[in-house]
């Protein structure tokens, strides 16, 4: 079991001309919400087919009213994540549909009106427990930016959330044949015996003795690949139970027309009606002329008065290329620091910095300690784009706000008793042991395995650990 999490970062007009009109107006204020639908596997499934992995609806976003005459900005979004719980194994490959809905808040009779603004779909591969994956999808003139991840709910762990973890029964190690559960190193993999012969790669069980198959596999032991050869659907194989895929999307799904073009289905494919200034099968071609200023670095543009005739750039000294965009190589001086990569853009040099660094030459380690106080006398240590607190004795936690129990880790060996002390901890050793942590046995003849104890300290006395 686990949760698929979706974070919407922005929804607004996509790149290029033909920006969409704002979905809200002063007369009809509105707010957005999102719906996500998940299906297992990589099958091209119709939008109407059930969301077998689950679905979720976001909260409503803030009310938005268009400013008259202003272009549609990125629209205000609902707070929080969309979470889709899944009960079974995470399939690893999945299809998604994300819909952006508009709720109009005018004086409609019978309450608010809902309408679908945009729908994006895709097929992805994702291991549970991995990092957030970022994505950009476009639907017509709208662009949606989002991140997603799948995470297991305890006690499940692993890339498919099929391994189970249990607290350790013994303090030091797991039982025979059982591994520690990364990242929960204090827990152990729980023994779970599936049906004998159940494929370890393609099957799993949540109850002892069962054998359930991952997407793409079938049979009592999940050893038989699902066949896709016996399908007759015109758009490809269909339905997971028969091992076939259901009919795929129509030619206009996801709107193949770029730059604000509108799509209409034709008997054989689709047709784009393009806005002014664009042409081509998908409205993807725009003519570049001298009026567009194609020559960089002071290059002089000649010809190209209309989109069908070429232009030529006459470059000033020190620049070359058909757009005068290339300067003589300057990156060989390796001006970028801290792993930044040097880009010679012709008109300028640019360092593309790695995460945690900034500045024209990536020379600044981002000051992660700025504005971050470490409590209780702790000092901030920065590096590599992350900050941490080095805490004073007796304190711990991210910001040194937690009082540390120096005895929590049971530091006194051989049955020694631990006492918290203002400057650390003190071990009172059991008879026969000595040392700061009672780690040294005292030999029967009175000699110890240590160099001579400091004057005045008898074996068995409390030892203060400094």
């Amino acid at each position: 079991a686990g949760v698929f999490e979706l974070q919407i970062h922005s929804f607004g007009p996509g790149p290029g001309p033909g920006a969409p009109r704002s979905p809200c107006s002063a007369r009809l204020p509105c707010r957005l919400f999102f719906r996500v639908c998940l299906k297992p596997g990589l099958s091209e499934e119709a939008a109407e087919s059930p969301c077998a992995l689950g679905a979720a609806l976001s909260a409503r976003g803030p009310v938005y009213t268009e400013q008259p005459g202003a272009p549609a900005p990125d629209l205000p979004l609902p707070d929080g994540l969309l979470q889709v719980p899944f009960r079974d194994a995470w399939p690893g490959t999945f299809s998604f549909i994300i819909e952006t809905w508009r709720e109009e808040l005018g004086d409609q009779i019978g309450g608010p009106a809902w309408s679908l603004l945009a729908r994006v779909a895709g097929r992805r591969r994702l291991a549970a427990g991995g990092p957030w994956a970022r994505d950009i999808q476009r639907a017509g003139a709208w662009e949606l930016r989002f991140s997603y991840r799948a995470r297991c709910e305890p006690p499940a762990v692993g890339t498919a959330c099929t391994r189970l973890c249990r607290p350790r029964s013994a303090p030091s190690r797991c039982g025979p044949g059982l591994r520690p559960c990364a990242p929960l190193e204090d827990e152990c993999e729980a023994p779970l015996v599936c049906r004998a012969g159940c494929s370890p790669e393609h099957g799993f069980c949540e109850q002892p003795g069962e054998c359930r198959c991952l997407e793409g596999w079938t049979g009592p032991l999940c050893t038989v690949p699902v066949s896709t050869s016996s399908c007759l659907s015109p758009r490809g194989p269909s339905s997971a139970t028969t091992g076939c895929l259901v009919p795929g999307p129509g030619p206009c799904d996801g709107n193949p027309c770029a730059n604000g073009g509108s799509c209409s289905e034709t008997p054989r494919s689709f047709e784009c009606t393009c806005p002014r200034g664009f042409y081509g099968l998908r409205c993807e071609v725009s003519g570049v002329t001298c009026a567009d200023g194609p020559c960089f670095n002071g290059g002089l543009c000649v010809g190209g008065a209309d989109p069908d005739s070429a232009y030529i750039c006459h470059c000033p000294p020190g620049f070359q290329g058909s757009n005068c965009e290339k300067r003589v190589d300057r990156c060989s001086l390796q001006p970028c620091r801290n792993g930044g990569l040097c880009l010679d853009l012709g008109h300028a040099l640019r360092c593309r910095c790695r995460a945690g660094f900034a500045g024209p030459r990536c020379e600044h380690d981002l000051d992660d300690c700025a504005g971050r106080a470490c409590a209780n006398g702790g000092t901030c240590v920065e590096g590599g784009g992350a900050h941490r607190c080095s805490c004073a004795l007796g304190f711990g936690g991210r910001d040194c706000r937690e009082r540390a129990d120096p005895c929590a880790a049971r530091p006194c060996a051989h049955g020694g008793r631990c006492y918290a002390h203002f400057s650390g901890l003190v071990c009172a050793c059991a008879p026969g042991y000595m040392g700061a942590r009672c780690e040294f046995p005292v030999h029967p003849d009175g000699a110890s395995a240590l160099p001579a104890a400091p004057p005045g300290l008898r074996p068995g006395d409390p030892q203060r650990y400094l």
């Epitope: 792993g339 930044g340 990569l341 880009l343 010679d344």
Partner: antibody
Framework: QVQLQQSGPGLVKPSQTLSLTCAIS??????????WNWIRQSPSTGLEWLAR?????????DYEVSVKSQITINPDTSKNQFSLQLNSVTPEDTAVYYC??????????????WGQGTMVTVSS | QSVLTQPPSASGTPGQGVTISCSGS????????VNWYQQLPGTAPKLLIY???QRPSGVPDRFSDSKSGTSASLAISGLQSEDEADYYC???????????FGTGTKVTVLT
């Protein structure tokens, strides 16, 4: 003349680890101006960049975020090569895998030299 | 899933010109150089144009590209039979923190 020679198995079983190696001749894996990349191509996903390694006073690695948890790229200066490891493969990882150099000074994003490609099939 | 969008096909007769578009967004084409690759059947891709209209040695000047905002295009003038291939655009994406490629365009030389 710079050349990249790929080696590795053409068939891998599901859930196993795919390991590929790219041997470099005519350049150095620890060059201060190149990046060394793995890219794959399949009919369903097209060209897909997977990972890169490069040296600028120290080694840096970058990974495509959706495969980050599965993948490892390693430079080997003693053999002047770099390798790719892809764990827990599934049939969706079936593709032609290429190694490539981003070797033009000032244009680290341009892959000017490519390996011959390795067709990898994931099947039991 | 490719982040950069190209038309699936383009064609022309020998001697004609053909243009291939590549549509992206502000985080890739809008803020980074665009590269173009040519892939002949059964071979690895070959760098055709890099950093907005630089050509590696050996690439004829019949190939040129231009960029405007979040779109780029590759122009092939004086089409020849050996230009029949798949063409891909690519760029670094600051948002995804990785390289992205176009969907690819198959250029056919009609005879």
């Amino acid at each position: 003349q710079v050349q990249l020679q790929q080696s590795g198995p053409g068939l891998v079983k599901p859930s196993q680890t795919l390991s590929l190696t790219c041997a470099i001749s005519g350049d150095s894996v620890s060059s201060n101006s190149a990046t060394w990349n793995w890219i794959r191509q399949s009919p369903s996903t097209g060209l897909e960049w997977l990972a890169r390694t490069y040296y600028r006073s120290k080694w840096y690695n970058d990974y495509e975020v959706s495969v980050k948890s599965q993948i490892t790229i390693n430079p080997d200066t003693s053999k002047n090569q770099f390798s790719l490891q892809l764990n827990s493969v599934t049939p969706e990882d079936t593709a032609v895998y290429y190694c490539a150099r981003g070797g033009i000074v000032g244009a680290p994003d341009a892959f000017d030299i490519w390996g011959q490609g390795t067709m990898v099939t994931v099947s039991s | 899933q490719s982040v950069l969008t190209q038309p699936p096909s383009a064609s022309g007769t020998p001697g004609q010109g053909v243009t291939i578009s590549c549509s992206g967004s502000s985080s890739n084409i809008g803020s980074n150089p665009v590269n173009w690759y040519q892939q002949l059947p059964g071979t690895a891709p070959k760098l055709l144009i890099y950093s907005n209209n630089q050509r590696p040695s050996g690439v004829p000047d019949r190939f040129s590209d231009s960029k405007s905002g979040t779109s780029a295009s590759l122009a092939i003038s004086g089409l020849q039979s050996e230009d029949e291939a798949d063409y891909y655009c690519s760029a670094w994406d600051d948002w995804l923190n990785g390289y992205v490629f176009g969907t690819g365009t198959k250029v056919t030389v009609l005879t």
